[in-house]
Interface confidence: medium
Amino acid sequence: MSGLGRSRRGGRSRVDQEERFPQGLWTGVAMRSCPEEQYWDPLLGTCMSCKTICNHQSQRTCAAFCRSLSCRKEQGKFYDHLLRDCISCASICGQHPKQCAYFCENKLRSPVNLPPELRRQRSGEVENNSDNSGRYQGLEHRGSEASPALPGLKLSADQVALVYS
């Protein structure tokens, strides 16, 4: 399965687009490059949107994109590109990465149905062994671009809504 590449800080270059799916962008001998979130269809001879084939199990060229798309549609999850995996925020709230902040902080504001260890943590009963109190200090916010915590994935407003919907 191929990894969903990341947009570079300061906009996208041709390199970003060509190498967005480092091992899965190219199909056939033609070696045609397609913009991000698209794949080369050798039969049609054109670039096609990955979204159109996400439901087709046999299609591997967009696997990473489709996986990240379905991941972002799930509440309280984010896609980590280095791990190439969908991560559940609910399971790591308390010492959560920045990309879980919205989900975890909202969860803590409404303590109903919180697991006991998180309820205790909220009321200060749990041993404070968090080492990430300043872990994201100095990570500047860059508008619609993700911080290094969600490396290089450029999110539009509706995609942000998807991440946290």
């Epitope: 270059s13 980590d80 490396p151």
Partner: antibody, heavy 118, light 107 residues
Framework: QVQLVQSGAEVKKPGASVKVSCKAS????????MHWVRQAPGQRLEWMGY????????KYSQKFQGRVTITRDTSASTAYMELSSLRSEDTAVYYC???????????WGQGTTVTVSS | DIQMTQSPSSLSASVGDRVTITCRAS??????LNWYQQKPGKAVKLLMR???RLHSGVPSRFSGSGSGTDFTLTISSLQPEDFATYYC?????????FGGGTKLEIK
């Protein structure tokens, strides 16, 4: 403070298996992904695989697929890496490393030397 | 996989020297470049993440720069404890890959 303490050196015969442990302390074990990286003599660091913190999900390097198994014991805050069908080229120092969710490994174990020799 | 190439592979320098180590990626990795320090028999230490952000406890004589495919780690004034092997690693995409290392020795 965060600490990853690994098990001691091992000497194994070709064809055998080795299981290395990595005990974590100073943080909530289930909140971070644990990776395993190895370094053969004179070689670069080589990523082997990882285990997700909350559901035992694993992903392995293609190079080690089928020979490596990463597990964990949450109650003991310990991760394990087992490598089977050992060969002489598996002689290396094996490290566990905590993933910081930002693309880097912020804390590493001290390393476990595994020697494969007949 | 993204290939990471470090140079030089070894380097002799004296205490007080300014030293620069370079790392090149086989494809654009933005700023997702990390640096580690390794001493014999010791745990590997993260020095710098995301090209230029010092990890906690790392002295300010260490600095990093670059973007895209070319990166540098600079030690402004070498101290005795800095003699070690340094590795770069790309955190841009799966799987994580490391450079071949630069061994910094006392001249």
């Amino acid at each position: 403070q965060v600490q990853l303490v690994q098990s001691g050196a091992e000497v194994k015969k070709p064809g055998a298996s080795v299981k290395v442990s990595c005990k974590a302390s100073g943080y909530t074990f289930t909140n971070y992904v644990m990776h395993w990286v190895r370094q053969a003599p004179g070689q670069r660091l080589e990523w082997m695989g990882y285990i997700l913190p909350y559901n035992d999900g694993t992903k392995y390097s293609q190079k080690f697929q089928g020979r490596v198994t990463i597990t964990r014991d949450t109650s003991a805050s310990t991760a394990y890496m087992e490598l089977s069908s050992l060969r002489s080229e598996d002689t290396a120092v094996y490290y566990c490393a905590r993933y910081d969710w930002e693309g880097s490994f912020d804390y590493w174990g001290q390393g476990t030397t595994v020697t494969v020799s007949s | 996989d993204i290939q990471m190439t470090q140079s030089p592979s070894s380097l002799s320098a004296s205490v007080g020297d300014r030293v620069t180590i370079t790392c090149r990626a086989s494809q654009d990795i933005g700023n997702y470049l990390n640096w580690y320090q390794q001493k014999p028999g010791k745990a590997v230490k993260l020095l710098m993440r995301y090209t230029s952000r010092l990890h906690s406890g790392v002295p300010s004589r260490f600095s990093g720069s670059g973007s895209g495919t070319d990166f540098t780690l600079t030690i402004s004034s070498l101290q005795p404890e800095d003699f070690a092997t340094y590795y770069c690693q790309q955190g841009f995409t799966f799987p994580p890959t490391f450079g071949g290392g630069t061994k910094l020795e006392i001249k």
